[in-house]
């Protein structure tokens, strides 16, 4: 368990001495403070590469840049897991790996990164505009998901570098650069706060947040009693949209498929919303959301151009798979 400080909504200063200049000097410290508070936020990176040798064979690499212990990794395609995506593989750090066609080989590359090779033949083969998502369930950070796809015009084998090193280098460079700025910013912030210490500042409200934060659940026991836990394979149609998982069991999905997040606004996007989401024309991109932030009603820490956010406040129960069938 850990306590995270949540940055309160900025309240406009009372009218008076400061005027327009005061507005600027007060907004800056809070922007810097926000950056300081969210500086240690973990991220997930995703790299998708088409093999030059087999045109319809893909390699997906994902990694988690955070300090928590990874409980589980789920790789899906066609959208975020639990929001229309179809599970390709589930990896547990000690208990092993489950994978479903067209996944050919899923494996751990390091303690915090995985790779997945997709078979490239027949109706189940992926195509260039397919989106692949990786979800890392980590404690105490929560669930973090990132998605990536090949740009439409990419040449086979050249869509992304053969290793995730450039991505990691970019991240490290970013981390180092941002760290410098943040260090300077935090020092400057302390300086400003010291100068304005006579003025009462809004307090930070600490709140206990962890993957065990309460969740609203809509149970459906009658369905669950017959639901299949494991789906040995998934039939994927050629249009590259995620296919329905066929389990040959008459009673719909399991109880947790119906599980709902606390706030409707935080529900993961459905397939329709997903289909209309523009994908940046890059072979790899980072996109993160922590269920903990969504739960607390706080804005996700990393947003900006090229970042698509998929809130999932439900933790690993939302992971589709053996029981996660519709």
């Amino acid at each position: 368990m850990r306590t995270e400080a949540q940055v309160p909504a900025l309240q406009p200063p009372e009218p008076g001495l400061e005027g327009a200049m005061g507005h600027r000097t007060l907004v800056l410290p809070w922007v810097l403070l926000t950056l300081c508070v969210t500086a240690g936020t973990p991220e997930v990176w995703v790299q998708v590469r088409m093999e030059a040798t087999e045109l319809s064979s893909f390699t997906i690499r994902c990694g988690f840049l955070g300090s928590g212990s990874i409980s589980l990794v789920t790789v899906s395609w066609g959208g975020p897991n639990g929001a229309g995506g179809t599970t390709l593989a589930v990896l547990h750090p000690e208990r092993g790996i489950r994978q479903w066609a067209p996944a050919r080989q899923a494996r751990w590359e390091t303690q915090s990164s995985i790779s997945l090779i997709l078979e490239g033949s027949g109706a189940s083969s992926p195509c260039a505009n397919t989106t692949f998502c990786c979800k890392f369930a980590s404690f105490p950070e929560g669930s973090w998901e990132a998605c990536g796809s090949l740009p439409p015009s990419s040449d086979p084998g050249l869509s992304a570098p053969p290793t995730p090193a450039p991505i990691l280098r970019a991240d490290l460079a970013g981390i180092l650069g941002v760290s410098g700025v943040l260090l300077f910013g935090c020092v400057y912030l302390l300086h400003l706060l010291r100068r304005h210490k006579h003025r009462p500042a809004p307090r930070l409200q600490p709140s206990r947040t962890s993957p065990q934060a309460p969740r609203a659940r809509a149970w459906a026991p009658s369905q669950a009693s017959q639901a299949a836990l494991h789906v040995p394979y998934a039939t994927i149609n050629t249009s590259c949209r995620p296919a329905t998982l066929d389990t040959a069991h008459p009673h719909g999905g399991p109880s947790w498929w119906a599980s709902l997040p606390t706030h409707a606004a935080h529900r993961p996007q459905g397939p329709a919303a997903w289909a209309s989401t523009p994908i940046p024309a890059r072979g790899s991109f980072v996109s993160v959301e922590n269920g903990l932030y969504a739960q607390a009603g706080e804005r996700p820490p990393h947003t900006g151009p090229g970042l698509t956010l998929f809130p999932d406040p439900r933790g690993p129960r939302a992971m589709e798979g053996p029981l996660g069938v519709r």
Partner: antibody, heavy 122, light 107 residues
Amino acid sequence: QVQLVQSGAEVKKPGASVKVSCKASGYTFTSYGISWVRQAPGQGLEWVGWISSYDASTKYSQELQGRVTMTTDTSTSTAYMELRSLRSEDTAVYYCARGSPIYEHFNWFDPWGQGTLVTVSS
Amino acid sequence: EIVLTQSPATLSLSPGERATLSCRASQSVSSYLAWYQQKPGQAPRLLIYDSSNRATGIPARFSGSGSGTDFTLTISSLEPEDFAVYYCQQLSHHPLTFGGGTKVEIK
């Protein structure tokens, strides 16, 4: 090494409640779940329910749904199982066992606690 | 719920003999089946998971096979410490269920 240590034997009257604890050590508690299994004297094994140590989601057997509550305390790596409105047929050895952080995958039980005998008698 | 039927209920064999235990599911559980061994006064111990994978520290004389509805646990050559009760468990459907057990006793 990986170990689950359970609380001691309990004797309860019908209608009372019992809370059994299971302290885990030797592994990352939040990377797994805990399942509870009971065994009546001379009988086979009966699955009671499961809790994820990662996000505290639970799954209970239909027979005990409404009477059983499972919780975890990640700060002490301890799982708890509370059974209410006890009946004589609840007399059994209750085992905790390490399972998976999600119910759907990897949910075999290894290792097991030593067991806690709960006797319900008037 | 899935019903697991174990047979025979009791198996009387001598040390060194081969033991074959059967577990049949009322409907397909794919390969998601585990086997446990339990000795009197002890907690069960995992032997096999996912039908055929030996758990850590389990001797090679224990092997599992099968998929769908029919599963087998084989002990190639019984050792004195192998005389115990063996349970199968399906991990494929909710609720998770156990078989009634097979007791392997000394002949």
